[in-house]
């Protein structure tokens, strides 16, 4: 029932106002102007973004599960926002913990050599039967973001005349026959079809793909960043290890592919104030327009400290304009040499290319522990994962609308294949909510000084444990 407010007595009017003030505490507000879509609705729950007809409906909404859940989340968010700033001793302890973890969990040069040997061995085995192919190591082994137990990612480069599915079927047969590998299986229905096997000597799991050029380009980018920015590798390792502890890094179980965590760290370092990493495209490029960013394609790493880009106009309108121009030119009988000259000029303008630096000129002075805490805070409180896209190419924050991607869960753009959301494997709302909840627990855990014996906490101890980084060193502060 909609109340005719003009007929109310003073008592009733005050009663209505009081009820509305109470509702505001529950994030339900009276609409100044009614929405044209919901003409009967007088109120809006700003927390759940739901239109409500009247006071009775509002009281009913308050009792709903989702509203209660959102209220709790809001309360937790404000609690997290009001956590005191960490002391320098606390940050120093965190820095030590992250460095220790990177040493403890990351791969050593010896581990890398073992992985490179696996590729060399496999190259010999496969090239005996497929001499025109070559094998390359990619992924976390090459970027040095691998944990000790991480899979070995191997890609097969093959000539254009070869058929991709046939090639993988042949590789499956070759590896099955070899005594060097056990548990050889195919996973051709995966997003990236692979042959999976275990290297008998090292017991490491190998995932063999073919023609996975984009992944190799991303690997080169992340590896180069690891070399030029000292904080990058330990932060990624800590982040990956945390994700592994929380069971959110398994793509096959609806989690996030592990290299996404590296892109998330990269994005955070670009977005923090002041930034520690530059974006890959920007105003330093003459004529760059963020609205037309997809006309600039990233092409790979040069000199280990630059990313190469090319300008190719993909705008339909521009193509149509050029087509019309060409048609007009064709209709006019003109001197052939002159026509070719103007065409060449127009092509030159369209085929711009250049390189962008991977680092900023000013050296980083921020302690690693502070960055770890900021990273968790960024994804817990500052960056709306559901609303925006993690895009490492430009400084501007991309909305889902910009990409035409649905407003759900996590979106991470592949810098080399910009139509691909590399976090699309996280496709369950429940898993997404779990990820968000893990971020909150981790930020709370690392933001609060920890005692050696463990803090008395109201948090679920099992959850709290998952927030920890290193099994050896508890984070403590004096």
């Amino acid at each position: 029932t909609v109340i005719d407010e003009s007929a109310l007595t003073p008592e009733q009017r005050l009663g209505l106002k009081q009820a509305e003030e109470r509702l505001e505490r529950d994030h339900i507000f009276r609409l100044e102007k009614r929405s044209p879509e919901y003409t009967n609705c007088r109120y809006l729950c700003k927390l759940c973004l739901i239109h409500i007809e009247n006071i009775q409906g509002a009281h009913k909404h308050i009792k709903e599960k989702r509203h209660k859940k959102n209220i709790l989340e809001k309360q937790e968010e404000s609690e997290l926002r009001s956590l005191p700033s960490p002391s320098s001793a606390h940050l120093a302890a965190l820095s030590v913990a992250v460095v220790e973890l990177a040493k403890e969990q990351g791969i050593t040069d010896d581990d890398l050599r073992i992985r490179q040997d696996i590729v060399e061995e496999m190259s010999k085995v496969i090239m005996t039967f497929l001499p025109e192919c070559s094998l390359r190591l990619y992924g976390s082994s090459l970027t040095k973001f691998a944990l000790k137990s991480s899979d070995v990612n191997i890609d097969i480069k093959f000539p254009p005349k070869m058929n991709h599915p046939d090639l993988l079927i042949q590789v499956l047969g070759i590896l099955k026959k070899s005594a060097l590998y056990i548990d050889v299986e195919s996973d051709f229905h995966a997003k990236v079809p692979v042959v999976v096997c275990k290297d008998r000597k090292s017991a490491l799991l190998c995932r063999v793909s073919a023609g996975n050029d984009m992944a190799c380009l991303t690997t080169d980018l992340l590896a180069a960043l690891g070399k030029v920015e000292p904080v990058f590798t330990p932060l990624v390792l800590a982040f990956r290890y945390w994700a592994k502890l929380c069971y959110i890094d398994s793509q096959t179980d609806g989690g996030i592919p592990s290299y996404c965590f590296a892109l998330m760290v990269m994005f955070f370092l670009q977005q923090r104030k002041p930034p520690l990493l530059p974006c890959l495209l920007g105003s330093w490029i003459e004529g760059f327009d963020p609205k037309r960013m997809d006309d600039f394609q990233l092409k790979g790493i040069v000199e280990e400290k630059f990313v190469k880009w090319e300008y190719n106009s993909s705008s339909a309108t521009e193509k149509n304009l050029i087509a019309d121009e060409n048609k007009a030119k064709a209709d006019e009988p003109k001197d052939d040499t002159k026509k070719t000259e103007t065409d060449n000029q127009s092509n030159a303008a369209k085929a711009k290319h250049g390189k962008s630096p991977l680092t900023l000129e000013a050296p980083n002075q921020v302690p690693l522990g502070q960055l770890w805490l900021e990273l968790l805070k960024f994804y817990t409180l500052d960056f709306a994962l559901e609303e925006y896209v993690i895009c490492v190419r430009i400084q501007d924050i991309l909305t889902r609308e910009n990409k035409n991607w649905p407003k759900r869960r996590i979106a991470i753009e592949d810098p080399f294949s910009v139509k691909r959301n590399v976090a699309r494997s996280l496709n369950s709302q429940l898993v997404y909510e779990y990820v968000v909840e893990r971020f909150r627990a981790a930020y709370r855990y690392f933001a609060c000084p920890q005692k050696k014996g463990g803090n008395k906490s109201t948090m679920d101890p099992k959850k709290k444990e998952k927030g920890k980084l290193s099994s050896k060193k508890p984070v403590k502060s004096d």
Epitope: E11, Q12, L14, G15, L16, K17, Q18, A19, E21, R22, E24, I55, Q56, H59
Partner: nanobody, 118 residues
Framework: QVQLQESGGGLVQAGGSLRLSCAAS????????MGWYRQAPGKERELVAG???????YYADSVKGRFTISRDNAKNTVYLQMNSLKPEDTAVYYC????????????WGQGTQVTVSS
């Protein structure tokens, strides 16, 4: 159960001032509109002033500019500051606490006598 206890009534000369207080016991003070009613002999009880949790106020035309209602949510108390009193303000003043939603219910105080002599 909410209990309301008024104080501050008494005899005052015309043009004088009085301050009424009403202390509410019970933990749900914030749910209620708090107000003051009065009843003069042989007349109906009328709403003099009311105030919501957020401080929205109402005054009867006869007292506008002379009376001020305020509430202290921390102390569960509502006040009525009465200035420039007139003989026609003589009445028993009742403190009231009420809600309209989800349904109407009202709690009343015992009342306090205010007499304005000319």
């Amino acid at each position: 159960q909410v209990q309301l206890q008024e104080s501050g009534g008494g005899l005052v000369q015309a043009g004088g001032s009085l301050r009424l207080s009403c202390a509410a016991s019970g933990t749900i003070f914030t749910y209620f509109v708090m107000g003051w009613y009065r009843q003069a002999p042989g007349k109906e009880r009328e709403l003099v002033a009311g105030i919501t949790l957020g401080g929205t106020t109402y005054y009867a035309d006869s007292v506008k500019g002379r009376f001020t209602i305020s509430r202290d949510n921390a102390k569960n108390t509502v006040y009525l500051q009465m200035n420039s009193l007139k003989p026609e303000d003589t009445a028993v003043y009742y403190c009231a606490a009420w809600v309209e939603y989800p349904r109407r219910y009202v709690y009343w105080g015992q009342g306090t006598q205010v007499t304005v002599s000319s």
